[in-house]
């Protein structure tokens, strides 16, 4: 009789997670009598996957009837494959004995599991930043196999190039994770902008997965302030308005000071949105000129999104207000944007009046 050979015809088999895998094995001889065992891996640490003679292997079945006369087909079927099943499987013939003795092993079949990446999750910076600053967005996706994967970043449909991507682990693994960090320069117009992380993988059949983040979560657009005096109202009353424009987010507190003393504090709420996603707000103060002997210094103080207050002052000249007339020019605007923001990009706002 010919010497027994254990034939595993496929060097490798690739299966999608959740599907079943068939691992083929035939022997060339009925001799010696004894069971077939399937192992994952080789050497002393190998894992028993199926034993023809004994044991309970709920996910593994023999393809041919093992009781069939002169059976030489010992192929197995593994159901509900997961990435943890990846590895090299060996069909091993044993000679009947106490214990059974290993006779010969097949060359092995490498089972690779195609697993879809999880939906990409995009996370932005922990704190908001202002225009012209660079913020980082991170995209993560897990559990995919094989390792080859493509990740792209877009901002409002335009592909970004400033990003760094890592796939872990570097060596062989049952499944992999990808992490990419993109750097995005903010502009004042980015309240409605979106960044998209797009992941393409062999398991997705050309239909990439996307994760998104809104720049509205990452941006802060500081307000412009303008204080003006309106026409005189009734006798001895001056109407001063503070226009707070183009700010985001809406969280804003405005305080009027008369000669340094708090006159009124207001909180912005339910403001209409501008086309670009920013907000405007106007507050006014009626000043009774006759109640003052000296000029009145009015300050509009705005605290936006927990940042240091921004002041804009305006002096109402009491001497310039004869009781019978009102004039828009009678009051002198001595205000300046007294921002003490540390952000360099705030300095250009001074020129927008």
């Amino acid at each position: 009789e010919e010497e027994l050979q254990v034939i595993q015809p496929e060097k490798s088999v690739s299966v999608a997670a959740g599907d079943s895998a068939t691992l083929n094995c035939t022997v060339t001889s009925l001799i010696p009598v004894g069971p077939i065992q399937w192992f994952r891996g080789a050497g002393p640490g190998r894992e028993l996957i199926y034993h023809q003679k004994e044991g309970h292997f709920p996910r593994v079945t023999s393809v041919s009837e093992s009781t069939k006369r002169n059976n030489m087909d010992f192929s197995i079927h593994i159901s509900n494959i997961t990435p943890a099943d990846a590895g090299t499987y060996y069909c091993v013939k044993f000679r009947k004995g106490s214990p059974d003795v290993e006779v010969k092993s097949g060359a092995g079949t490498e089972l690779s599991v195609r697993a879809k990446p999880s939906a990409p999750v995009v996370s932005g910076p922990a704190v908001r930043a202002t225009a012209e600053h660079t913020v980082s967005f991170t995209c993560e996706s897990h559990g995919f196999s094989p390792r080859d994967i493509t990740l792209k970043w877009f901002k409002n449909g335009n592909e970004l190039s400033d990003f760094q991507t890592n796939v872990d682990p570097a060596g062989k693994s049952v499944s992999y994770s990808i992490r990419s960090t993109a750097r995005v320069v903010l502009t004042r117009r980015d309240v409605h902008s979106q960044v998209i992380c797009e992941v393409a993988h062999v398991t997705l059949q050309g239909d990439p997965l996307r994760g998104t983040a809104n720049l509205s979560e990452a941006i802060r657009v500081p307000p412009f302030l303008e204080v003006t005096q309106q026409s005189m109202r009734a006798d001895n009353q001056v109407n001063v308005t503070c226009q707070v424009t183009k700010f985001y987010p809406q969280r804003l507190q405005l305080t009027w000071l008369e000669n340094g003393n708090v006159s009124r504090t207001e909180m912005a709420s339910a403001l209409p949105e501008n086309k670009d996603g920013t907000y405007n707000w106007t507050s006014w103060l009626l000043v009774n000129v006759s109640a003052h002997r000296d000029d009145v210094k009015l300050t509009c103080q705005v605290e936006h999104d927990g940042q240091p207050a921004v002041n804009k002052s305006f002096s109402v000249k009491v001497s310039a207000h004869p009781k019978e007339q009102g004039s828009n020019t009678a009051a002198e605007n001595t205000g300046t944007n007294e921002r003490d923001y540390k952000d360099d990009d705030d300095k250009h706002h001074h020129h927008h009046h």
């Epitope: 009789e1 009925l30 001799i31 004994e54 009837e65 093992s66 009781t67 002169n70």
Partner: antibody, heavy 119, light 110 residues
Framework: QVQLVQSGAEVKKPGASVKVSCKAS????????INWVRQAPGQGLEWIAM????????HYNQIFKDRATLTTDTSTSTAYMELRSLRSDDTAVYYC????????????WGRGTLVTVSS | DIVLTQSPDSLAVSLGERATINCRAS??????????IFWYQQKPGQPPKLLIY???NLDSGVPDRFSGSGSGTDFTLTISSLQAEDVAVYYC????????FGQGTKLEIK
């Protein structure tokens, strides 16, 4: 290791039936055929039948086809052989044996059950 | 049915001597390159024990003084040097079709 444990001796009257059991352990019961063989006192071995516990496929020796019935209970890994219309010449030791190589051979044997048919 | 005929019916051999038992089939028991003949040893009060499978292959744990040979219809079991514990009845069995046994050969010490 493989073990086949058979039920105890039986004494039956002619015309009665006997059901001998064979409980298997040490291997996956559904993966191997069970054979039944008998041996009359001082005589040779006589093959009765075989059963595949995985699907209850059976093959009978023509001599016993009408009187013997093989069954299995996979939940208890037990094989049964029932012989009906007993005659005195059915007095014998009845063996179950497991076919390890799917070669229709008998690799492992039970210790036997003596069935005595006597009026 | 294939009938197996063993010869001799009984045999007496001196300790240390060679014992030979023959088994002849009424038709060939060979198929696909295999000879479907098996040899069993049965000692008094015990069940049979498989010695040789597929005509010439020693079963696990069987001493190598036992050997099997033959093909087609004629087969031989040989004990190269008889030991006292080899006293038993020996049976051949075929499985080319449904199994049948030879009538047995009783081996004794001379």
């Amino acid at each position: 290791q493989v073990q086949l444990v058979q039920s105890g001796a039986e004494v039956k009257k002619p015309g009665a039936s006997v059901k001998v059991s064979c409980k298997a352990s040490g291997y996956t019961f559904t993966n191997y055929w069970i054979n039944w063989v008998r041996q009359a006192p001082g005589q040779g071995l006589e093959w009765i039948a075989m059963i595949d516990p995985s699907d209850s496929e059976t093959h009978y020796n023509q001599i016993f086809k009408d009187r013997a019935t093989l069954t299995t209970d996979t939940s208890t890994s037990t094989a049964y052989m029932e012989l009906r219309s007993l005659r005195s010449d059915d007095t014998a030791v009845y063996y179950c044996a497991m076919d390890y190589g799917s070669l229709y051979a008998m690799d492992y044997w039970g210790r036997g059950t003596l069935v005595t048919v006597s009026s | 049915d294939i009938v197996l005929t063993q010869s001799p019916d009984s045999l007496a051999v001196s300790l240390g001597e060679r014992a030979t038992i023959n088994c002849r089939a009424s038709k060939s028991v060979s198929s696909s390159g295999y000879n479907y003949i098996f040899w069993y040893q049965q000692k008094p009060g015990q069940p049979p024990k498989l010695l040789i499978y597929l005509a010439s292959n020693l079963d696990s744990g069987v001493p190598d003084r036992f050997s099997g040979s033959g093909s087609g219809t004629d087969f031989t079991l040989t004990i190269s040097s008889l030991q006292a514990e080899d006293v038993a009845v020996y049976y051949c069995q075929h499985s080319r079709e449904l199994p049948t046994f030879g009538q047995g050969t009783k081996l004794e010490i001379k």
